[in-house]
Each structure stands twice: as structure tokens, then as C-alpha cells.
């Protein structure tokens, strides 16, 4: 389990996104929703404060399909 009391920055954040997202790949920011004009990026959410697995997974890209 990810230790939620700690923050993830730089290489630690990239490592964890790569491992968790795997073949999906990942984004550093999500597209802004209709509700919010500005979407927080993962650095703001996981480096400046702690984040959990569920939040990390929201930055995984939409699964690609095999050719």
C-alpha cells in the first residue's frame, strides 16, 4: 500500500505513476472538467500534499488498444 502520509515528487512520482499506470501511461495534468475551469496537476496534488492510490490512478491515461 502507498504510505499516504508522504508526498511524492520528481523521480519518485514518475516511478510510481509508471508502475501503477503501466501500459496505460500517464498525464501530469487532467483535462479541466465542465465544473472547474482549472484542474490541479499531479505535482500540486501529490508533491505539495499527500495523495493515495485512487488519486494517482486518475492520472493514468485512457487504455490504448492493441493493434
Amino acid at each position: 500500500a502507498y504510505r499516504p502520509s508522504e508526498t511524492l515528487c520528481g523521480g519518485e512520482l514518475v516511478d510510481t505513476l509508471q508502475f501503477v499506470c503501466g501500459d496505460r501511461g500517464f498525464y501530469f495534468s487532467r483535462p479541466a472538467s465542465r465544473v472547474s475551469r482549472r484542474s490541479r496537476g499531479i505535482v500540486e496534488e501529490c508533491c505539495f500534499r499527500s495523495c493515495d492510490l485512487a488519486l494517482l490512478e486518475t492520472y493514468c491515461a485512457t487504455p490504448a488498444k492493441s493493434e
Epitope: 519518485e12 516511478d15 490504448a64 493493434e67
Partner: antibody, heavy 118, light 106 residues
Framework: EVQLVESGGGVVQPGRSLRLSCAAS????????MTWVRQAPTKGLEWVAY????????YYRDSVKGRFTISRDNSKNTLYLQMNSLRAEDTAVYYC???????????WGQGTLVTVSS | DIVMTQSPDSLAVSLGERATINCRAS?????MHWYQQKPGQPPKLLIY???KLASGVPDRFSGSGSGTDFTLTISSLQAEDVAVYYC?????????FGQGTKVEIK
Amino acid sequence: EVQLVESGGGVVQPGRSLRLSCAASGFTFSNYYMTWVRQAPTKGLEWVAYISSGGGSTYYRDSVKGRFTISRDNSKNTLYLQMNSLRAEDTAVYYCTTEDYGYWFAYWGQGTLVTVSS
Amino acid sequence: DIVMTQSPDSLAVSLGERATINCRASSSVSYMHWYQQKPGQPPKLLIYGTSKLASGVPDRFSGSGSGTDFTLTISSLQAEDVAVYYCLQRSSYPPTFGQGTKVEIK
């Protein structure tokens, strides 16, 4: 050439502890996240634990959470797996592994056998 | 967790004949990855990204499939191909492997 060499396996009684080590060479260890994968006798492969390159992020499979701790010493190019409260179902060959993006679990050690038996 | 189910559990094929191994995921995945494990050795990456051969892998090995159904094919079985083959999904956390398929010579 990537080389991973595990050690520390052996026979242990249920409820006891064991610490596995994995000595890495042939690559810049501190730049790579690492994982442990295990293989029970005559069974398949099971991812066990993950640690980021600097050690700040760890993940575990549900069945070992709270009992196993993955850690690393980048100054010694060594990965560890501390296994506490061992159970018979933890009996397996434990492999130290790492990967490049897309080349998942591309590099493996030879494994170390852990037998939990009374 | 995504459950990976391989079929058959084992198969015996004559030298020079085709061997086909299937892997089904309980949910759709982006790609499938395949590993070969010979007795007394660690697994070795064989095919990544569904159909790409890892370095040094002979072209008699091929992979295909999409969604939930994937296939590993050995077009002309050689003696050195005797091994257990595993599929892996990395599209969903946690990573999960198939139970393995043992390939023997008939």
C-alpha cells in the same frame, strides 16, 4: 549487463521472520524502481512488492500488507524484503526484478527459496 | 484485480509443429506480455506489447490479440522451447500473471 543476485532465503518456522537481500550491478541502481515477485512451488508468478527509486513510495500485494516491508540502500546497490509473521503460503522462490517502461519485469535475479514449515 | 486465465494448462507438440497458447483477461487490457521459464531458471521476457519480440527471441515466436483474448504462437516447435509460458497484464494495478502453460515435446 544487469545483474541481480538474491540471498537470505532458507527454512523458517511459521510466525518467524526472514530478510531477503538483492545485490544489483550493471546498471544505475538508484535510477530504477524495484520489485519482488514470488513463485510458489509448482505454481505461477505473483507480484509481491514495489519500491520507487529513492525509496519514498512502496506498494504491496494485499496478502503481505502489514507483514512484509520492502526497502533499499542505494549506497550499497541493495534491495531488501523484510518478511515477518511468515505463513506456510509464503513458501516460494522470491525474485528481485526491475523493468524499463514497456519492458515490464524485464530483468530478474536467479531467485532465493523461502520455505515456511514447522 | 484482473484475473488472467491461460489455456491449456499443458500441451504436447511434435517437433516442427505449431504450438498455440491462449490467455484471457477478466477485463479488457491494453496489451499482453509473455514470459518463458525454463526449468531451474527465472522467467525471461519473450514478447512485449502483445506482438513485439524481446531482444534475441527467435521469430518463430509471435503474439496477437486484443481486448480480453490474446495468443502466443510458436510456429515450429524446437527442443529448446520446452518451458512454461506465462502471460502478464500491466494495464491495471496490480500486475497479474496467468497461471502458466507447460509446453512439452510429443
